[in-house]
């Protein structure tokens, strides 16, 4: 049998095989050692008994999407049946005081591989023997601790495979420089040691994506905005836009990155090298936000231009290649495969990423201020309580609710929260009356809200003893 007979039904074309050479991977045309590594079809009854106490689940994840040329990392985690775990020496043991369907186990081991390897090797002290090999016959690498690594992982994609000896989690990184753009399939088969052979215990597959577009996300934040995820924001207050580039392998670390913003409100283009920008919309309405991110990334050099004919001018050193694989064409001049030749054959490719969002701008409460506080004289029966009137003004739209949160002087431990609807005139002047139990210093957070906004002001107040001569003090605002 060959690797492709064992590992997957997806057969890439000859073109794909030739053009997707992965560094350190081998062709799946190689022979698979079925004596050491038996092959079971899906549904084979032997899967039922491949692991003591249940089935092992393999979870395959990746940090896809990957910008072409960057590294993509795949991680496989084995999930053992309940109450089982891997110990420090790579043996699979039952967790102490853990009860599964079979009850508490007397034997601490599910698989005691240490015992097997110590008495079954016959390796003349070299650690090498005919069974310490991968499915293609290559010997296991002799990392320190390799004897505690009891799982064999075979990764398979694009007509190639990669073998790795490991423990209950492994990770493999692949450079995507030669990978065709678009979605690809990664399949992983996992075997465990079984005496002098191996037994399959899990198979898993996952789709990953290689793209020539920089994966871009934008977070938006605005003070007083009630719901930051609904893309509705307030007029006359700055919105902070923060660009996050998905680049887990740090491929773009040494790239110059430019951000080109169009806010859709006729304020023109704004170009920056900073990943955060503030913008204030001064009109209500719906606006189309567009961002183009440009990064000069390391890339292959174009073929040298043909020698010039005497009658024509010398072609420029900047060569532009047409890209047929780009998912979303950028604006004019934003070709994803624009190459510039620089000395000593290190070249750069301009890569682009795009983000578009529709933003709705509405009126909101822009500001709230406490302009006055008055101690209201209480009738005699409540000598311990103080009634205080807060006179509050606001700017922007008219609030529909007011909340006060009274807490300790550090503003951390809430003592009392009261919310109530309010009916405010156009001048936006209102009086909020609150009770304070006892003298002392309090932190007062006062918020005015409507459907789309929530404006806050805070103050520390000092409530005196109930002595008419003691004035009420605003500690600071």
């Amino acid at each position: 049998k060959r690797f492709h007979d064992v590992l997957g039904n997806e057969r890439p074309s000859a073109y794909m095989r030739e053009h997707n050479q992965l560094n350190g991977w081998s062709s799946d045309e190689n022979d698979w050692n079925e004596k050491l590594y038996p092959v079971w079809k899906r549904g084979d009854m032997r899967w039922k008994n491949s692991w003591k106490g249940g089935r092992v689940q393999a979870v395959l994840t990746s940090d896809s999407p990957a910008l072409v040329g960057s590294n993509i990392t795949f991680a496989v985690n084995l999930i053992f049946p309940r109450c089982q775990k891997e110990d420090a020496n790579g043996n699979i043991v039952y967790e102490k005081n853990c009860r599964n369907e079979a009850g508490l186990s007397a034997d601490p081991y599910v698989y005691n591989w240490t015992a097997w390897s110590e008495d079954s090797d016959g390796e003349n002290g070299t650690g090498q023997s005919h069974h310490n090999v991968f499915p293609d016959g290559k010997p296991f690498p002799h990392h320190p601790g390799w004897r505690r690594w009891n799982f064999i992982y075979v990764f398979h994609t694009l007509g190639q495979y990669f073998q790795k000896l490991g423990r209950c989690s492994v990770r493999v990184s692949v450079n995507t420089a030669n990978v065709t753009l678009g979605p690809q399939l990664m399949e992983v088969t996992v075997y465990r040691r079984h005496g002098r052979a191996y037994v399959p215990i899990a198979q898993v597959k996952d789709v990953y994506v290689v793209t020539d577009q920089i994966p871009v996300f934008v977070t938006m934040f605005q003070k007083n905005d009630r719901n930051s995820s609904d893309e509705t924001f307030l007029k006359d207050l700055p919105i902070m836009f923060d660009v996050l580039i998905h680049d887990p392998s740090h491929f773009l670390n040494y790239s110059t990155i430019n951000y080109k913003w169009s806010f859709g409100d006729n304020t023109g283009l704004f170009v920056s090298t900073n990943h955060t920008v503030n913008h204030t919309y001064v009109l209500n309405g719906t606006f189309s936000l567009n961002l183009t991110v440009k990064a000069a990334a390391p890339g292959p050099c174009p073929p040298p231009p043909p020698p010039p004919r005497p009658s024509k001018p010398t072609p420029s050193l900047a060569t532009t290649l047409k890209s047929y694989d780009s998912n979303t064409p950028g604006p004019a001049g934003d070709n994803p495969l624009e190459l510039s030749r620089i000395p000593d054959e290190n070249c750069q490719i301009n890569r682009y990423g795009h983000f578009q969002a529709t933003i709705t701008i509405v009126e909101g409460i822009l500001e709230v201020n406490i302009i006055q506080m008055t101690d209201v004289l209480m009738p005699v029966p409540w000598p311990e309580s103080s009634l205080i009137d807060f006179v509050v003004t606001c700017q922007g739209s008219i609030p529909t609710e007011v909340c006060t949160i009274i807490s300790d002087p550090t503003c951390e431990i809430t003592q009392n929260t009261v919310c109530s609807p309010v009916d405010v005139d156009e001048m936006c002047l209102l009086t909020v009356r609150r009770t304070f139990n006892g003298s002392g210093t309090y932190c007062v957070n006062l918020t005015l809200g409507d459907d789309t906004s929530l404006a806050l002001t805070s103050t520390l107040i000092s409530v005196p003893d109930r002595d008419p001569a003691s004035p009420l003090r605003m500690a600071n605002s």
Epitope: A75, D87, H143, G145, W149, G166, S169, R171
Partner: antibody
């Protein structure tokens, strides 16, 4: 260059807790197993705990099992050691040390400068 | 892991030998560290005999199974330190008790 910088040591009473941190730089932190090793004043080296490259598995010396917890945050390139129910015999300089391999099965190729933990009533 | 001697005193340019004995076969899974006074341990040798890069060639390691040796072929003043062996064939990882090397 590879750097490991420990912090969080100090004087603590028996039975109390302390959290040590180790900030890593100069290498791809998420590819390596990392250990805590301690050294009591004037004494030899003692291995304390190890955590795998991905944080999945953690192993401890019998002397600290159930009291100490090793953890890591790969996004912050930081290793932690939460030490609870501290005893007089836990007083030592605590080093974080990198294992050259992902599972922390082997030896220590880079060490931090250490942070001193004193347990005293 | 038993290290011997626990301390030694030798002259500059002397050949110095430190031994480390394991209670069971650990193949070649042994490392050696140097710790200078008031400093951090430093890896000298791993896999019993492989010199860590940057370590002077006067240091060498040998042995396999249960008996291991660290040799300093020509002792230098800067070699004053405590030397530790460490096994890593299986968990837990353990250190020898240390050998303190001084100059006569």
């Amino acid at each position: 260059q590879v750097q490991l910088v420990e912090s969080g040591g100090g004087v603590v009473q028996p039975g109390r807790s302390l959290r040590l941190s180790c900030a890593a730089s100069g290498f791809t932190f998420s590819n390596y197993g990392i250990h805590w090793v301690r050294q009591a004043p004037g004494k030899g080296l003692e291995w304390v705990a190890v955590i795998w490259f991905d944080g999945r598995n953690k192993y401890y010396a019998d002397s600290v099992k159930g009291r100490f917890t090793i953890s890591r945050d790969n996004s912050k390139n930081t290793l932690y050691l939460q030490m609870n129910s501290l005893r007089a015999e836990d007083a030592a300089v605590y080093y974080c040390a990198r294992d050259p391999f992902d599972y922390g099965d082997s030896f220590f190729d880079y060490w931090g400068q250490g942070t001193l933990v004193t347990v005293s009533s | 892991l038993t290290q011997s001697p626990s301390s030694l005193s030798a002259s500059v340019r002397d050949r110095v030998t430190i031994t480390c004995r394991a209670s069971q076969d650990i193949s070649n899974y042994l490392a050696w560290y140097q710790q200078k006074p008031g400093k951090v341990p430093n890896l000298l040798i791993y896999a019993a005999s492989t010199l860590q890069s940057g370590v002077p060639s006067r240091f060498s390691g040998s042995g396999s199974g249960t008996d291991f040796t660290l040799t300093i072929s020509s002792l230098q003043p800067e070699d004053v330190a405590t030397y530790y062996c460490q096994k890593y064939n299986s968990a837990p990882l353990t250190f020898g008790g240390g050998t303190k090397v001084e100059i006569k």
